[in-house]
């Protein structure tokens, strides 16, 4: 039941956090135009990872895109491939850890498959987050030398009659959100692997087997693994040797005087 | 067709508040806002203040500690007080509909003449 | 504030001459993130209301007559008219529509010779 939870709430946050990287590549306001210490200007500027907006007090917005590729600074082009990165994996991720959900029953999969199936998605999710944290930093990292630049800029060279306002620009509300949603995903990929200890099948875990002598020969069963299907069931696997050891599950038992356990 | 009409006395005694009056039509008041300008006889311009379809206003620095600009959109109307006036705010004053597009005054009222005199 | 200087303070003129007003800002008027100049241009007819002929520094209002025109960018602008007519008459001011508060320049008197 708590592997079941574990595994549940790790898909939920997941898909939150994707959902909130999806968003913040999208967003416009990844860097804002800093108000503080400024003239005051009826105009207000903000940019995203795919185009930059200008709005004017009256409410008019214009945006206009980045229609060049190679004329884009390579931090942003290398922020947007994170990002994009991330989302793929999420997406991947998501989907993997749909089928991989304990509380559905997908034809006579068995829980060691699901088990990997949610490590795997696991790992997406966690990598998935990294990017979307990774990216946003890098992007973070970029405004604030690009900041104290202009800010060394603003008060040089104003020895002449006319002023030139640098505009300075400031985390705009995307890299919180990325933070948040990359977190998110981070946290749920975390879950996910934790939840594929509890699904796992132990690596011996092989029920107490009764041996006793038999012929010279122990002649091996053919199809020897039992696969169990149905859904709550003991899933574990048990060899069979015919007239050499049997589980305890089988039915027929016959102890002697030969018999250990 | 968009119009704007100023309205309010001509004439104001010196220290005392003065209210005008700007009714709109024509145009919404949730998409455009109204900027306030004087002209004293005989000289330039002179930028007050404006109100944005928003809500915001801002003033001329000159000016802050005295004026006041609201909207009552139940009326149509925008609203202008200057207080503790004196005789140099003697001048035509005009309203005029902010534009949607590069920070500008698209349409302009006639203008009211307020005389300061005691 | 940021200060409006416009030259000349009047400006005779020949009917179907062109004609020139500057306009300069103590401060640029360019904003970066849509390399637009926040600088209007109005024309006000004796005893009559202002009304706007230019936005955007360039940009001509619907309505104006296309011989008007505007360029400059940053801190310096012109307003010509390619070939003066008497209806243009009137005094011609720059405004700043960038920083509050926002300010208008001084004027220039536009007059037939």
């Known amino acids: 039941m708590a592997v079941t939870a574990c595994q549940g709430l790790g898909f939920v946050v997941s898909l939150i956090g994707i959902a909130g990287i999806i968003a913040a590549t999208c967003m416009d306001q990844w860097s804002t135009q800093d108000l503080y210490n400024n003239p005051v200007t009826a105009v207000f500027n903000y940019q995203g990872l795919w185009r930059s907006c200008v709005r004017e007090s009256s409410g008019f917005t214009e945006c206009r895109g980045y229609f060049t590729l190679l004329g884009l600074p390579a931090m942003l082009q290398a922020v947007r491939a994170l990002m994009i990165v991330g989302i793929v994996l999420g997406a991947i991720g998501l989907l993997v850890s749909i089928f991989a959900l304990k509380c559905i029953r997908i034809g006579s999969m068995e829980d060691s498959a699901k088990a990997n199936m949610t490590l795997t998605s696991g790992i997406m999710f966690i990598v998935s987050g990294l990017c979307a944290i990774a990216g946003v930093s890098v992007f973070a990292n970029m405004l604030v030398t690009n900041f104290w630049m202009s800010t060394a800029n603003m008060y040089t060279g104003m020895g002449g009659m006319v002023q030139t306002v640098q505009t300075r620009y400031t985390f705009g509300a995307a890299l919180f959100v990325g933070w948040v949603a990359g977190g998110l995903t981070l946290i749920g990929g975390v879950m996910m692997c934790i939840a594929c200890r509890g699904l796992a099948p132990e690596e011996t875990n092989y029920k107490a087997v009764s041996y006793h002598a038999s012929g010279h020969s122990v002649a091996y069963k053919p199809g020897g693994f039992k696969a169990s299907t149905g859904f709550g069931s003991n899933t574990k696997n048990k060899k069979i040797y015919d007239g050499g050891a049997r589980t305890e599950d089988e039915v027929q038992s016959y102890p002697s005087k030969h018999d250990y356990v | 067709q968009v119009q704007l009409q100023e309205s309010g006395p001509g004439l104001v005694k010196p220290s005392e508040t003065l209210s005008l009056t700007c009714t709109v039509s024509g145009f919404s008041l949730t998409t455009y806002g109204v900027h306030w300008i004087r002209q004293p006889p005989g000289k330039g311009l002179e930028w007050i203040g404006v109100i944005w379809a928003g809500g915001s206003t801002n003033y001329n620095s000159a000016l802050m500690s005295r004026v006041t600009i609201s909207v009552d959109t139940s009326k149509n109307q925008f609203s202008l007080k200057l207080s503790s006036v004196t005789a140099a705010d003697t001048a035509v004053y005009y309203c005029?509909?902010?534009?949607?597009?590069?920070?500008?005054?698209?349409?302009w009222g006639q203008g009211t003449m307020v005389t300061v005199s005691s | 504030d940021v200060v409006m200087t416009q030259s000349p303070l009047s400006l005779p003129v020949t009917l179907g001459q062109p004609a020139s007003i500057s306009c300069k800002s103590s401060q640029t008027l360019l904003n970066s993130g849509n390399q637009k100049n926040y600088l209007t241009w109005f024309q006000q007819r004796p005893g009559q209301s202002p009304r706007r002929l230019i936005y955007w520094a360039s940009t001509g209002e619907s309505g104006v007559p296309d011989r008007f025109s505007g360029s400059g960018s940053g801190t310096d602008f012109t307003l010509k008219i390619s070939r003066v007519e008497a209806e243009d008459v009137g005094v011609y001011y720059c405004q700043n529509a960038y920083f509050y508060p926002f300010t208008f320049g001084g004027g220039t008197k536009v007059e037939i010779k």
């Open positions: 005029a509909r902010a534009a949607y597009y590069g920070n500008g005054l698209d349409y």
